[in-house]
C-alpha cells in the first residue's frame, strides 16, 4: 500500500490520528520537507538574539545578535560580546591590543602590524590598536644613492601616533 | 490594548507624508508591526512590517517608495513619490503569536492623494 | 509574486446554512494562510492562521483547511453578524528582504 504520507507537503505533518491526513504544522513548529510525520518545534530568538526572520510553516526562524554582540557559528548559533575596534576579546573581557598589534573590527582578534621591511619598504604611516601601518616606497626609492640597509623608521607608540 | 493610526491627510501627488501608529498596553519589540491599506471599495494591500528584532521587510511594490521604522511605543510609515493610486485608508496591526499576521487592528487613517 | 485567487466573489446562504470560501496559492506556502472578516467601516479580524489554527475569541463555527496551493474557510450554522467580506492571505518570504504578504480578492457573504 502507497504511504500516503509522501504526498503531505512542506509545512504540514502526516497525521496519523486522522487516517494520514496532512496537517498544517501548528503555531511555532515547521516541516521543510514533505512526508513528514511531526513538525519540528521553531527556533526562539531571545535574550541576546533577536528575530531576523519569523517561523514560518516551512522553515526555521533566523535570529541575529542583538546590539553589542555579533554573530558566531552556523546560523548564528552563539552571540559573542563585540569589543571596540583596538580591542580583542579575551576571556576575561575586551582587551587592548598588545603594542605591535592591531584590530580594525569590532570582532575578532588582534593582528601584527605589517612588516614593511620585508617587502623592501619603509613605514609610511606608523601602526595604531585600531589600524595597520602603512608601507611607502622602499627607502632606495625615497633617496636615490641611499644604501639599501638603511632601516625603515621605526613604529611608535600607538598611544604617541599623530592623529 | 490597542493601535491607532494618525497623520492621514489630503496631499498632492509627489508629497511626502509620514503617518504614525501609537500603541498602548503592549511592547512594540516584542511583535511584528504591520501596515496594509485599503482603497476606497477595494481589498487589502499588504505594504510591509517591522519585526520584533526590529528588521523590515516590504512588499515588492513598496520596497523602496515606503519606510518604516519604530520607537519604543510608534511605528511609522514614511512614504514618498504619492500618486493619486495611494489614495487609501491605511491601517496598522500587531501581529499574532511571533508572526506577520494582523491581529489587533487600528481603526484606520485616510489618506487622499488628489491634484 | 504569489497570486491568491479566491473563489467565489460572492455567495449568499440563509440563516443556519452553510458557506465555503475556497483559496489558490499559485505556489506553494505550506500551510502560511490566515482569513479574515471585514465589516463596512471596520478594519479586518483575524479568524484563523496557518491554515486551521482559530484566532483568540473567534467561533468554532469557523473552521480552516487545506495546504500547499489549496486552502478552505467553511462557516456553518450561519448567522446575520456573519455577513462581511472575508479575505484569505498567504505568508510567503522572498528574496532580498521582499514578502509576499499577498491578499485574495475577498468574498463578499450575504446572509439571507
Known amino acids: 500500500l502507497q504511504d500516503l504520507c509522501s504526498n503531505c507537503p512542506a509545512g504540514t505533518f502526516c497525521d496519523n490520528n486522522r487516517s494520514q491526513i496532512c496537517s498544517p504544522c501548528p503555531p511555532n513548529s515547521f516541516s521543510s520537507a514533505g512526508g513528514q510525520r511531526t513538525c519540528d518545534i521553531c527556533r526562539q530568538c531571545k535574550g541576546v538574539f533577536k528575530t531576523r526572520k519569523e517561523c514560518s510553516s516551512t522553515s526555521n526562524a533566523e535570529c541575529d545578535c542583538i546590539s553589542g554582540y555579533h554573530c558566531l557559528g552556523a546560523e548564528c548559533s552563539m552571540c559573542e560580546q563585540d569589543c571596540k575596534q583596538g580591542q580583542e576579546l579575551t576571556k576575561k573581557g575586551c582587551k587592548d591590543c598588545c603594542f605591535g598589534t592591531f584590530n580594525d573590527q569590532k570582532r575578532g582578534i588582534c593582528r601584527p602590524w605589517t612588516n614593511c621591511s620585508l617587502d623592501g619598504k619603509s613605514v609610511l604611516v606608523n601602526g595604531t590598536k585600531e589600524r595597520d601601518v602603512v608601507c611607502g616606497p622602499s627607502p632606495a626609492d625615497l633617496s636615490p644613492g641611499a644604501s639599501s640597509a638603511t632601516p625603515p623608521a621605526p613604529a611608535r607608540e600607538p598611544g604617541h601616533s599623530p592623529q | 490594548q490597542s493601535v491607532e493610526e494618525s497623520g492621514g491627510r489630503l496631499v498632492t501627488p509627489g508629497t511626502p507624508l509620514t503617518l504614525t501608529c501609537t500603541v498602548s498596553?503592549?511592547?512594540?519589540?516584542?511583535?511584528?508591526m504591520i501596515w496594509v491599506r485599503q482603497a476606497p471599495g477595494e481589498g487589502l494591500e499588504y505594504i510591509g512590517f517591522?519585526?520584533?528584532?526590529?528588521f523590515t521587510y516590504y512588499a515588492s511594490w513598496a520596497k523602496g517608495r515606503f519606510i518604516i521604522s519604530r520607537t519604543s511605543t510608534t511605528v511609522d510609515l514614511k512614504m514618498t513619490s504619492l500618486t493619486v493610486a495611494d489614495t487609501a485608508t491605511y491601517f496598522c496591526?500587531?501581529?499574532?503569536?511571533?508572526?506577520?499576521?494582523?491581529?489587533?487592528w487600528g481603526p484606520g487613517t485616510l489618506v487622499t492623494v488628489s491634484s | 509574486d504569489v497570486v491568491m485567487t479566491q473563489t467565489p466573489a460572492s455567495v449568499s446562504e440563509p440563516v443556519g446554512g452553510a458557506v465555503t470560501i475556497k483559496c489558490q496559492a499559485s505556489?506553494?506556502?505550506?500551510?502560511?494562510l490566515a482569513w479574515y472578516q471585514q465589516k463596512p467601516g471596520q478594519p479586518p479580524k483575524l479568524l484563523i492562521y496557518?491554515?486551521?489554527t482559530l484566532a483568540s475569541g473567534v467561533s468554532s463555527r469557523f473552521k480552516g483547511s487545506g495546504s500547499g496551493t489549496e486552502f478552505t474557510l467553511t462557516i456553518s450554522d450561519l448567522e446575520c453578524a456573519d455577513a462581511a467580506t472575508y479575505y484569505c492571505?498567504?505568508?510567503?518570504?522572498?528574496?532580498?528582504?521582499?514578502?509576499?504578504?499577498?491578499f485574495g480578492g475577498g468574498t463578499e457573504v450575504v446572509v439571507k
Open positions: 498596553g503592549f511592547t512594540i519589540n516584542s511583535y511584528h
Open positions: 496591526a500587531r501581529g499574532v503569536d511571533g508572526t506577520s499576521y494582523p491581529d489587533l
Open positions: 505556489q506553494s506556502i505550506g500551510s502560511d
Open positions: 496557518r491554515a486551521s
Open positions: 517591522i519585526n520584533d528584532g526590529g
Open positions: 492571505q498567504c505568508i510567503y518570504y522572498g528574496s532580498d528582504d521582499v514578502i509576499y504578504h499577498t
